[in-house]
Interface confidence: low
């Protein structure tokens, strides 16, 4: 509560996160024209990335475009992209939706459709839906340990959310264990009133708010965090504003001295840890 | 404007960015001693990296050192690095400017120059100027969508910069469309009084400031962002303080069971999104 | 000092860091069953990663698991993980400490021990101690240049920590050169009362605080940074709360058309640059 006689000061904060969990992924894999079920294991090195401070990312879904090489090929026949003659294609034109630069020629994409030829990473990425259910939907059971160190420089006071008395095998629960800083990802979503399984398909951004309301007067000292959760991306967002959360990255390699890449469109949850609060002292 | 009767509170913010655009890069490529013009396409997976929150990076230029391997070789003959005898070279010495550790021998770098031999990734990186004009100078036409979700926890008020009424094909303009959150990179520079083509050579840091001045009283409610732009790196910086913005990263691979790497010195624009403002309520 | 007549405003800040230095690493390398001493050079592209803004990471130690492939293998025989019959192994079970999913079979790990077979990246990571002394302990002599641009939007005032008069070959010292913004990593630790050599083994988080106390009145103008350092991770942390600072990442490659990876558990120092302060004006 506000004590008007107190000198209030905003918190200076540092965050460290550690995600734990493994996922078994089952997907259709095509080799030599034959499609079969493939099983693979994803661990932290596969589904998360070395991130800085106040954010961490967990990949929950993906679409791969394997064996791309820089050359000429027909672009993907998305709505409005088909052509019937070269007149429809403009040499040097970069369509914002396209993945390459047009050569000016209209060429067959498959037996029934023709599209403008482009200079690009080929074959161009297919604009297919994110797999449903999400490939790493079991990430719901992953846990994240959040370590938060705070400082009120004016009061020369430092503390952290993990106390020596804490139990390393706890799991946060709003009622039973509100000071535990190990969170099950599915619980975070449940607390925020969101459905993990649903969000995992397209990705999203989840806020973990850590609020420190600190009374630093020695006679009524109190300084512990309160955790709350809310979704930060707009689930009702129009398609043109890129709903969910995804990014593309590439694994480059050489084959017969030709540079190739596997393009991965990674969907997932970015967790933003938002630390705020004040320290008051007489 | 300041209303003294209001309780003011700083903003808690989360940012999500999405860059769009492709670049055609033309550069001299040497293979088997023959130099020819090479054309390649760069898309988001090639010129940007999965970044967290309030920053994103767009590579606008680069210098590559291909096929480096860990061995012994002469260091690059930069100013003051040449030698005429072993006496000039000190075994175990690491020159801060050098890329390796001296063996103590003075060896030929080319027909006319000798330098100290080093244990390093060889051949050592040539200290050549960044290409001018910048290889990805067409990044000026890339666009970035900025999604910003804000929260005033004390007032229990949340909003975002993208409204349902917004048009997904808009482009920000200070006068014509100041609420559109899709920005052309070239326009950002123009607004900040900077020349994109020039900055793209060495790289730089550009601030996108989002200012929320929110009056949360129901009878005079107003809460919309104002965007402004300013360059954050010092364009007049002395050479010794590393002007522009660049970093080195490596692509590692194996050839005949020998680990090799391609070293890329990437120049580009780091965009920092600086969100600030206050929410006031009676 | 607090001047009650002044309008105070928090600082808006942007940070850019540049690490310099090379390390020689000597470690045991096993090839074809023969173990010999291997020497390698690590430069910035090897030990640091393109990071955003207010954090940078320097790898000081690592453990590698080379040539992993997705298949079935015995899990690592850590405490409590050994088995004597299939009954101890549960098909589909993911032990939080394990790196894979149990198949239900109990199989030999080596001549004397049996563990549950798992579907995982195999052979599974050995749970061995971080090397002591740290492999990149010489990172103590690396330097970091910190560029900090600050802005008080309400006062329309901008400045930076690097002045035109500064000497690019300086090194920060609290007494002799408190305005130099090139810091030796070992000095940062010394100032914070910490032992770099010790922290380098398991990793840690170090805070670099930049405090701007700015009086922007023209007749008594003062606006320069003050640097201070403090360790942000808990050195006395219980094992269950993951002491130090490390993360795993992977280098993926193909061999005979089989995807393989080298898993690196990287220990190191994450430096968080915490900028705070106020600008006051009549």
């Amino acid at each position: 509560s506000d004590k008007l006689y107190q000198r209030k000061e905003p918190v200076i904060s540092s965050v460290h996160t550690k995600v734990k969990g493994i996922a078994e992924v089952t997907e259709n894999v095509t080799e030599g024209g034959v499609t079969k079920l493939g099983h693979s294991i994803f661990d932290t090195a596969d589904y998360t990335f070395p991130l800085q401070g106040n954010s961490f990312f967990v990949m929950t879904n993906y679409v791969k475009s394997e064996g791309q090489v820089q050359t000429l090929c027909p672009e993907y026949p998305r709505r409005g992209a088909q052509c019937s003659s070269d007149r429809r294609c403009k040499k040097g034109w970069m369509d914002p939706q396209s993945k390459g630069i047009q050569t000016g020629r209209c060429v067959p994409y498959d037996k029934t459709r023709k599209t403008c030829e482009v200079s690009a990473w080929c074959p161009t990425e297919e604009e297919k839906e994110a797999p449903r259910p999400a490939l790493l939907r079991s990430a719901e059971n992953f846990t994240v340990l959040i370590k938060n160190n705070i400082h009120f420089p004016g009061h020369n006071y430092t503390t952290r959310n993990i106390l020596p008395t804490m139990n390393g095998s706890c799991t946060f629960h709003k009622a039973w264990d509100p000071q535990c800083s190990i969170f099950r990802l599915g619980d975070i979503f449940q607390e925020a009133g969101e459905n993990f399984t649903e969000v995992a398909v397209q990705g999203g951004i989840m806020g973990i708010e850590i609020y420190w309301d600190c009374n630093l007067d020695s006679w009524s000292h109190h300084c512990r965090p309160r955790y709350s959760f809310r979704r930060l991306d707009d689930k009702n967002m129009d398609e043109s504003f890129v709903p969910g959360y995804n990014f593309r990255y590439a694994k480059y390699y050489k084959e017969n001295n030709v540079e190739k890449r596997t393009l991965i469109k990674a969907f997932g949850i970015r967790f933003d840890i938002l630390v705020f609060g004040t320290g008051g002292k007489f | 404007s300041d209303k003294l009767y209001q309780r003011k509170e700083p903003v808690i913010s989360s940012v999500h960015t999405k860059v769009k655009g492709i670049a055609e890069v033309t550069e001299n490529v040497t293979e088997g001693g023959v130099t020819k013009l090479g054309h390649s396409i760069f898309d988001t997976a090639d010129y940007t990296f999965p970044l967290q929150g309030n920053s994103f990076f767009v590579m606008t230029n680069y210098v590559k050192s291909e096929g480096q391997v860990q061995t012994l070789c002469p260091e690059y003959p930069r100013r003051g690095a040449q030698c005429s005898s072993d006496r000039r070279c000190k075994k175990g010495w690491m020159d801060p400017q050098s890329k390796g550790i001296q063996t103590g021998r003075c060896v030929p770098y080319d027909k006319t120059r000798k330098t100290c031999e080093v244990s390093a990734w060889c051949p050592t990186e040539e200290e050549k100027e960044a290409p001018r004009p910048a290889l990805l100078r067409s990044a000026e036409n890339f666009t970035v969508l900025i999604k910003n979700n804000i929260h005033f926890p004390g007032h229990n008020y949340t909003t975002r910069n993208i409204l349902p009424t917004m048009n997904g094909s808009c482009t920000f303009h200070k006068a014509w469309d100041p609420q559109c959150s899709i920005f052309r990179l070239g326009d950002i520079f123009q607004e900040a009084g900077e020349n994109f083509t020039e900055v793209a050579v060495q790289g730089g840091i550009m601030g996108i400031e989002i200012y929320w001045d929110c009056n949360l009283d129901s009878w005079s409610h107003h809460c919309r962002p104002r965007y402004s732009f300013r360059r954050l790196d010092d364009k007049n910086m002395d050479e010794s303080f590393v002007p522009g913005y660049n970093f080195r990263y490596a692509k590692y691979y194996k050839e005949n069971n020998v680990e090799k790497r391609t070293l890329i010195k990437a120049f580009g624009i780091r965009f920092d999104i600086l969100v600030f403002g206050t929410g006031g309520k009676f | 000092s607090d001047k009650l007549y002044q309008r105070k405003e928090p600082v808006i800040s942007s940070v850019h860091t540049k690490v310099k230095g090379i390390a020689e690493v000597t470690e045991n390398v096993t090839e074809g069953g023969v173990t010999k001493l291997g020497h390698s050079i690590f430069d910035t592209a090897d030990y640091t990663f393109p990071l955003q803004g207010n954090s940078f990471f320097v790898m000081t130690n690592y453990v590698k698991s080379e040539g992993q492939v997705q298949t079935l293998c015995p899990e690592y025989p850590r405490r409590g993980a050994q088995c004597s019959s299939d009954r101890r192994c549960k098909k589909g079970w993911m032990d939080p400490q394990s790196k894979g999913i149990q198949t239900g079979r109990c199989v030999p790990y080596d001549k004397t021990r049996k563990t549950c077979e798992v579907s995982a990246w195999c052979p599974t990571e050995e749970e061995k101690e971080a090397p002591r002394p740290a492999l990149l302990r010489s990172a103590e002599n690396f330097t970091v240049l910190i560029k900090n641009n600050i802005h008080f939007p309400g006062h329309n005032y901008t400045t930076r920590n690097i002045l035109p008069t500064m000497n690019g070959s300086c090194t920060f010292h609290k007494a002799w050169d408190p305005q130099c913004s090139i810091f030796r990593l070992g000095d940062i630790f010394q100032e914070a009362g910490e032992n770099f050599t010790e922290v380098a083994v398991q990793g840690g988080i170090m805070g670099i605080e930049i405090y701007w106390d700015c009086n922007l009145d023209s007749w008594s103008h003062h606006c320069r940074p003050r640097y201070s350092f403090r360790r942000l991770d808990d050195k006395n942390m219980d094992e269950s709360f993951v002491p130090g600072y490390n993360f795993r990442y992977a280098k993926y490659y193909k061999e005979n058309n089989v995807e393989k990876r080298t898993l690196i558990k990287a220990f190191g120092i994450r430096f968080d640059i915490l900028v705070f302060g106020t600008g006051g004006k009549f």
Partner: nanobody
Amino acid sequence: EVQLVESGGGLVQPGESLRLSCTASRFMLDYYDIGWFRQAPGKEREGVSCRFTNDGSTAYADSVKGRFTISRDIVKHTVYLQMNSLQPEDTAVYYCAAGPLTKRRQCVPGDFSMDFWGEGTLVTVSS
């Protein structure tokens, strides 16, 4: 080794209540399914009540439904079995066990291959 320590057993009259406690040490309670099992003299061990870690759901043997309740106190690192309206046929040694339960929502004989077992605590219901 992981330890599970049961307590709270004893002699009670029919219709009375008991609360059994199972305390775990040095092990991750939140990662394992937890179950209470019992073995009456000359009979097979049977499942009484289980708590599933993945979603916190619980399951009970038909014979104890409505009378027994399983709960967990994360801070104290303890699992409880609250037993009301006890009958003579509830007389048994009660064991606490932890491990992965495969058939979700069930806690029945033959379905458990728990990794960790306590020593047991004797509950005698007799007038």
